[in-house]
């Protein structure tokens, strides 16, 4: 594996070459962690401490801001509860979602008293509206955590908000909620570590199962403590959880609780020299690459090791067909707290728990109509026995010999002369971005990774906590505690002044145009375009 980047650019070099634009934050704000990209309006909305920003995608130096602090009374109450006035007793924005054509929905910690509201953004970009609906505040419980240190994953679809968060002041009652809309809130089971065991939520995504929207599912990605007996000693497991979009809760024991919730472990590991696999269990971020078939996105996951002794990071890819196969497989079962987990061998009730009520897969109209045995089984068997293994059974990127860990990932699919390539932009905990291309070898999923660039995007080392990629603008947007950075997806001119250097770079965005290394456009009818991503061979492509 080529672990040395083709280009390594310091923050100073990035600035000097006009390859980074930074918004270094406001004196009275921080925590620029919550991103919402709006390509149509050409805006990046960012939720931070006491503020929501609307940045111009062309240049983030051009922005509007909304100030949304808490009242002095609320701040004092928070302080009296023993919380830190600067780090906790403020309104840290945790949810920022498109509500409809004219409004966003935003939720914040509200100084340990979660609160939500609507933000008007107008019908058209030229309306230039960006204002808080001051008259309409809502309880943010079950939407945003109380504690700004806690992670939240959320998704707003059809006027309903799905959130994985902590629903209590102490930050111990973790649940996946559905709120807003016209229905009673629905949540995961309380007081049952088999459902959720101190989870850290990463993200939530809507994925279609079939052409029938009744089959749509919401998938949550999170990491959590392994359940006793699942692993010897204390361990973390990465998870994917599913919920049917049309789950309205059950009856009897699952009234207003999910009836279709299932979870499975995500494995990202490499075989060790001693026969013991090295596991990357700490899921940090997830990116879904939708291409051609929206029912089958490729899932990119960024993982780190749990060990303090051995620090490493990896990127694993998963196929949704593998995920679905696991959810159709055996349920995890054990007869008591001191027993091992085994695949459930008994009779699985009909309709199979986890199946969405629809005309496609079964003859029942609502989760409220599920038979008692289905409800009882679903409540007792939320986990699958088999894990989801990555494509090719191994990570596509591994970093173990460095002083940083991966935190974020976004992926761009790029058309090159010799095919399509997935270019990964990986954020780290020291404020650098790695640009990595995965190059297929014999089969498309047997990949070689090439580290193209390592760029420092913030003046001081600071963990990257948010990333968005605009294909329209060909720009990358990066968030951290310190501020927001913007950089182009490609810096072809920096690769050098010769065809060989351009070709050796193996950057799918770039090709030699006869006089310079420049952006490659597949539509351009230029016979002189020299590019070889698969082999990086200048001899066959460069005549100079």
């Amino acid at each position: 594996k080529n672990n040395v980047p083709r280009l390594k650019l310091s923050y100073k070099e990035m600035l000097e070459s006009n390859n980074v634009i930074t918004f270094n934050g406001l004196a009275n704000s921080s925590s620029y962690h919550t991103f919402l990209l709006d390509e149509e309006r050409s805006r990046l909305y960012v939720g931070a401490k006491d503020h929501i920003f609307s940045f111009d995608l062309v240049n983030i130096k051009d922005f509007q801001k909304i100030v949304w602090p808490v009242s002095y009374t609320r701040r004092d109450e928070c302080k009296w509860a023993g919380k830190d006035i600067l780090k906790e007793c403020a309104n840290f924005i945790k949810v920022l979602k498109a509500y409809n054509q004219t409004h966003l929905y935003a939720c914040g910690t509200g100084a340990f008293h979660p609160i939500c509201t609507y933000i008007e953004i107008g019908h058209h970009p030229e309306d230039n509206i960006f204002k808080l609906e001051n008259s309409h505040f809502e309880n943010g419980r079950g939407k945003s955590p109380y504690d700004p240190k806690l992670l939240t994953a959320s998704l707003l679809i059809d006027g309903e908000l799905y959130s994985g968060t902590a629903a209590d002041f102490m930050g111990r009652d973790f649940a996946i909620f559905r709120t807003l809309g016209h229905h009673h809130p629905i949540r995961t089971e309380q007081h049952d570590s088999r459902w959720l065991n101190d989870p850290k939520f990463i993200s939530a995504h809507l994925i279609s199962e079939s052409d029938n929207p009744e089959d749509d599912k919401v998938y949550f990605f999170f990491r959590e403590n392994a359940i006793d007996g699942e692993h010897s000693g204390k361990a973390t497991h990465a998870r994917i959880g599913q919920i049917c979009k049309n789950d309205f809760g059950g009856h009897r024991s699952l009234v207003n609780k999910w009836t279709t919730f299932l979870k499975a472990r995500l494995i990202c590991s490499v075989p060790g020299p001693n026969g013991i696999d090295t596991h990357f269990d700490e899921l940090q971020d997830v990116f879904l690459m939708n291409f051609k078939d929206p029912k089958n996105p490729v899932v990119y996951g960024v993982f780190t090791t749990s060990s303090n002794i051995f620090k490493g990071s990896a990127v694993c890819m998963y196929s949704m067909s593998d995920v679905r196969r696991v959810f159709l497989g055996p349920y995890a079962h054990r007869d008591g707290p001191n027993y091992q987990w085994v695949p459930y061998q008994g009779r699985v009730p009909y309709p199979r728990p986890g199946t969405c009520p629809s005309k496609t897969f079964g003859g029942f109209d609502s989760t409220k109509d599920l038979p008692d045995d289905v409800i009882t089984f679903a409540r007792s068997h939320p986990a699958m026995y088999n894990p989801v293994f990555p494509m090719n059974n191994r990570p596509i990127v591994i970093k173990t010999d460095v002083n940083y860990q991966f935190t974020q990932i976004v992926v761009d699919r790029v058309d090159a002369e010799d095919g399509q390539y997935d270019v990964m932009f990986i954020g780290t905990d020291v404020g650098t971005v790695l640009k990595v291309v995965s190059i297929p070898k014999e089969t498309w999923y047997d990949l070689e990774e090439v580290l193209l660039e390592e760029m420092t995007v913030f003046r001081e080392p600071t963990a990257i906590s948010a990333m968005e990629l605009s294909t329209k603008q060909q720009q990358l947007y990066i968030g951290s505690t310190a501020g927001v950075a913007q950089l182009p997806l490609h810096r072809c001119d920096i690769y050098g002044k010769a065809c060989a250097e351009c070709c050796l770079a193996r950057d799918p965005y770039c090709a030699w145009d006869g006089s310079a290394c420049s952006r490659y456009f597949p539509t351009a009818k230029r016979a002189t375009r020299a590019q070889d991503i698969r082999n990086g061979d200048p001899l066959t492509h460069c005549s100079d």
Epitope: R141, A167, R194
Partner: antibody, heavy 123, light 112 residues
């Protein structure tokens, strides 16, 4: 009709033990979280302990932690409270109560109560 | 010392309206948790009167109503009747431990 019937109370010396039982009927006992709440003579209510439907979660008030043990037998529709190292301040009527979770935010309420059983700790 | 504060006693004549307050803190009622109210008639077990701040279980007369604001909640009883003479307790969630907290109770006396 939901019914909760406590038993097992009585007079016990300090340091002694008692085991309270609560027989449930009229509802699907195995589906509900159950609790013990006590009331000292002439005083207010105090939550003592709670247990989830499958015994996966168990909680205790600080005042009884390490001395009391809550358990349930779903096959017998019965809730138990094993009380050890009893003190004079444990003297109270002990109620068995069902968690209702009737509210929007799933915050526990107690929708059904037993009639209580009196525990007196005295030498 | 109860975590939720209630007045020890209130009184009112038949037909009158009385309110009972319940004050908590930012880690219980003020944290957005729901408040429930119980009525305990002399010599009997408590009975759920109001759940989720303002909802009445079936069988509870609409003379009883609940509300919540900030770190406080209140129970209002209109058209006071002799059979309303009882102890009233508020209760809130308080996180995993102590899980739930009660007010100290308020003795309602119906005069006359």
């Amino acid at each position: 009709e939901v019914q909760l019937l406590e038993s097992g109370g009585g007079l016990v010396q300090p340091g002694g033990s008692l085991r309270l039982s609560c027989a449930a009927s009229g509802f699907d006992f195995s589906s509900y979280e159950m609790n013990w709440v006590r009331q000292a003579p002439g005083k207010g209510l105090e939550w003592v302990s709670g247990i989830s439907w499958n015994s996966g979660w168990i909680g205790y008030a600080d005042s009884v932690k390490g001395r009391f043990t809550i358990s349930r037998d779903n096959s017998k529709n019965t809730l138990y409270l094993q009380m050890n190292s009893l003190r004079a301040e444990d003297t109270a009527v002990y109620y068995c109560a069902r968690s209702g979770y009737s509210s929007s935010w799933f915050d526990p309420d107690f929708d059904y109560w037993g009639q209580g059983t009196l525990v007196t700790v005295s030498s | 010392q109860s975590v939720l504060t209630q007045p020890p006693s209130v009184s009112g004549a038949p037909g009158q309206r009385v309110t009972i307050s319940c004050t908590g803190s930012s880690s219980n009622i003020g944290a957005g948790y729901d408040v429930h109210w119980y009525q305990q008639l002399p010599g009997t077990a408590p009975k759920l009167l109001i759940y989720g701040n303002s909802n009445r279980p079936s069988g509870v007369p609409d003379r009883f109503s609940g509300s919540k604001s900030g770190t406080s909640a209140s129970l209002a009883i209109t058209g006071l009747q002799a059979e309303d003479e009882a102890d009233y307790y508020c209760q809130s969630y308080a996180g995993p431990n102590p899980y739930v907290v009660f007010g100290g109770g308020t003795k309602l006396t119906v005069l006359g």
